[in-house]
């Protein structure tokens, strides 16, 4: 319900008796307010007083009416000013004036805390003429007050040039508390202290702060807004919450868990992305973090053959993005992989364990002890060669490939021959005399070919030489070796 | 809260700064003002700081003191030639209002324990 | 500026009794008036605000009344605690300018 208070008819200052066109008590009220603003109408209302300070806000006409009595100066009449009511009530305030006739088109604009309030406001100004003046009454209504409506209110006319300013009216909107920072959720080591935070104005102020704990007050007195609360240190999860109090009731701030720091839970779900001969791609899903970051994880392997002697490698790794490559391993090998992740209090147990394998490689080492012989009868080079160590191989050996080079004056010429697996010598014809053939030999597996031996070198006299010396891959640190005939 | 500090015995015509520091309360939304109380004597209102870093003075205060917020926690009463008449405990108080206007109803809801301010030869 | 009058300077009363203290203001604030009670070396309490609005946590016995030049502080039912300083203070401001004013003080002494 809204309550009206009325202004009474007052002579208006500097005009000889009363003032022409003074409201009736069936005009439009000048203040309305809900009966909950604590307010004493009948003390709220005086008229203008002449002589105040805060110019600005009269204008002096320099016009004179027809019997040349001068205008008094133009000012808003006194309202009241410092409303104070509940969120969600109607009020209704207003500024009046009185306008000599002498001027037309005055309109009057409201404005809220320095900026004009335009559109979808209740704002209705109502004029009543007379002889002489017109009263003039701007009324502003809110149905339902909210705290954005807080703030000074202003009228403004303007009028020949002039700007007349009313007194300020400031809506006081008064409300349950209002939280401006409420506790947040932590993740907190065992048994250390931390702080939580709470914070909720009015008005009403002052407003009180309770404490709640797993749906149990904390604090048996109060405490003035903001507050902090010094928790010494839980040994389990816990869920805190703060009331604000006021005059006008109690608001409750969201719930918050407060979780103790723990070491993760191991990594599931560790999975082969991708195999090579000396490398396996590995991803893995996280664990819970103990809420705790993760800082990093370690990757464990283990040769999986039972006759290995069981040592364990360790790659570490950052815990993003769930994804690593192990490298340095051997070719056509089964490993054993497990993955644990840390946090700041400590690291996982490991995840399961898989098993892994690496691919066929090319072999990583070169046939060795190769030799290279002329065969003039046949017209032949024998090649002879020891295959590499097995555990070099990295898979199984397929064959060698042979390259040959036959240089003589000017001219160059390589010849690729494949041969298999069986055995370790070959025979290839000579393709030019007097001339030098180089020789190189690769081991080769499904995973590819090997790396080339050392060239070794033979000269190809013309027809009618004979050759009964061999040529060998030279010892190591000989670079180029040629054999003279 | 609010705690002013700074208060000493100085020198006649000697400048002075009081410092007001406040905690739990943002100066961005609040006005905070100056009171002083000469011994055994009234309140006095010098001036205040409007959340938006508007100053008001009272009249006889023009000239003689400026206030001036120095960080989002303190607020500076410099009192800047200080005769004997300005021997008083100086308080700081913070407006009723939050909003960041340059004017509004300004009294004061909180206040300082005060700091006392002794000028002498 | 505005000037704030407060009467009487001094004012003496049973337990139990009613002190009335007046102010007034030298134009017109219309209810931009608080009172605030202050014991010795203590900062100023803010009792009413709005002229009759009583601040939270203070008693009903504290009464603000008046609107415009004159305002009246009542106290009834005086009590031992209630023996302080007493003063008005007018917060009246413009779109331009804030007037900020108290007044001289009432001293209540119970008896």
């Known amino acids: 319900a809204i309550t009206e208070a009325r202004e009474e008819a007052k002579p208006y200052p500097l005009f000889p008796g009363p003032f022409p066109g003074s409201l009736q008590t069936d005009h439009t009220p000048l203040l309305s307010l809900p009966h909950a603003s604590g307010y004493q109408p009948a003390l709220m209302f005086s008229p203008t007083q002449p002589g105040r300070p805060h110019t600005g806000n009269v204008a002096i006409p320099q016009v004179t009416s027809v019997e040349s009595k001068p205008l008094p100066p133009l000012a808003f009449k006194h309202t009241v000013g410092h409303i104070i009511l509940s969120e969600h009530k109607g009020v209704k305030f207003n500024c009046s004036i009185s306008v000599p006739n002498i001027y037309q088109d005055t309109t009057i604009s409201w404005w809220k805390d320095g900026k004009e309030l335009l559109g979808a406001h209740h704002a209705i100004t109502q004029f009543y003429p007379d002889d002489e003046v017109t009263a003039i009454i701007a009324s502003f209504s809110i149905t339902s007050v909210q705290r954005s409506d807080n703030g000074s209110y202003i009228c403004k006319m303007k009028i020949n040039n002039e700007e007349i300013v009313s007194d300020p009216i400031y809506i006081e909107v008064q409300g349950l508390p209002h939280f401006t920072k409420q506790p947040e959720s932590m993740n907190v080591t065992r048994n250390t202290a931390f702080n939580l935070t709470c914070q909720a104005v009015g008005p009403p102020e002052p407003v009180n702060i309770f404490w709640v704990q797993n749906s149990s007050r904390v604090n048996e007195q109060p405490e003035k807004s903001p507050s902090v609360l010094t928790v010494p240190g839980l040994t389990e999860m816990a869920v805190f919450s703060c009331e604000a109090h006021n005059d006008k009731g109690l608001t409750v701030s969201k719930g918050v868990q407060i979780n103790i720091k723990a070491i993760p839970s191991p990594p599931t779900e560790v999975s082969i992305r991708n195999s090579t001969a000396h490398s396996i791609l590995i991803s893995w899903v996280p664990g819970f973090d103990g809420y705790s970051p993760f800082r990093n994880c370690s990757i464990q392997v283990k040769e999986a053959d039972p006759l290995s002697n069981g040592s364990v490698m360790i790659f570490n790794t950052s815990a993003l993005p769930h994804l690593y490559q192990i490298k340095q391993l051997q070719a056509l090998a089964n490993y054993s992989i497990g993955v644990s992740c840390m946090n700041e209090i400590g690291w996982s147990a490991v995840s399961p364990w898989i098993l892994a394998s690496t691919t066929e490689g090319a072999p990583s080492v070169a046939p060795l002890n190769v030799t290279v012989f002329l065969n003039e009868s046949s017209d032949n080079v024998d090649i002879r060669w020891m295959k590499p160590p097995t555990k070099q191989q990295d898979g199984e050996l397929v064959g060698y490939r042979i390259s040959h080079v036959w240089q003589s004056a000017g001219i160059s010429k390589e010849l690729l021959e494949e041969v298999g697996q069986n055995g370790s010598r070959a025979r290839i014809s000579v393709q030019v005399h007097n001339a030098t053939c180089t020789v190189r030999i690769a081991a080769v597996t499904r995973g590819g070919v090997g790396p080339f031996s050392d060239p070794v070198k033979i000269f190809i006299p013309a027809h009618g030489w004979v050759d009964y010396a061999p040529s060998s891959t030279p010892a190591p640190g000989n670079a180029d070796p040629v054999l003279i005939i | 809260s609010l705690e002013e500090s700074g208060g000493r015995l100085v020198t006649p015509g000697t400048p002075l700064t009081l410092t007001c520091t406040v905690s739990?309360?943002?100066?961005?939304?609040?006005?905070l003002g100056w009171v002083r109380q000469a011994p055994g004597k009234g309140l006095e209102y010098i001036g205040i700081?409007?959340?938006?870093?508007?100053t008001y003075y009272a009249t006889w205060a023009k000239g003689r003191f400026t206030i001036s917020k120095t960080s989002s926690t303190t607020v500076d009463l410099k009192i800047t030639g200080p005769t004997t008449e300005d021997t008083a405990t100086y308080f700081c108080?913070?407006?009723?209002?939050?909003?960041?206007?340059?004017?509004?109803?300004?009294?004061?809801?909180?206040w300082g324990p005060g700091t006392l301010v002794t000028i002498s030869l | 500026d505005i000037v704030m009058t407060q009467t009487p300077a001094s004012v003496e009363a049973a337990v139990g009794g009613t002190v009335t203290i007046k102010c007034q203001a030298s134009?017109?604030?219309?209810?931009?008036l608080a009172w605030y009670q202050q014991k010795p070396g203590q900062p100023p309490k803010v009792l009413i605000y709005?002229?009759?609005h009583l601040a939270s946590g203070v008693p009903s016995r504290f009464k603000g009344s008046g609107s415009g030049t004159q305002f009246t502080l009542t106290i009834s039912d005086l009590e031992c605690a209630d023996a302080a300083t007493y003063y008005c203070?007018?917060?009246?401001?413009?779109?331009?300018?804030?007037?900020?004013?108290f007044g001289g003080g009432t001293e209540v002494v119970v008896r």
């Open positions: 108080a913070r407006g009723a209002y939050a909003g960041y206007v340059a004017f509004g109803p300004y009294y004061f809801h909180i």
């Open positions: 739990g309360i943002d100066l961005s939304s609040y006005a």
């Open positions: 203070q007018s917060y009246f401001y413009s779109s331009t300018s804030i007037y900020n004013a």
């Open positions: 134009q017109s604030i219309s209810n931009f």
């Open positions: 700081i409007s959340s938006t870093g508007t």
């Open positions: 709005a002229a009759s």
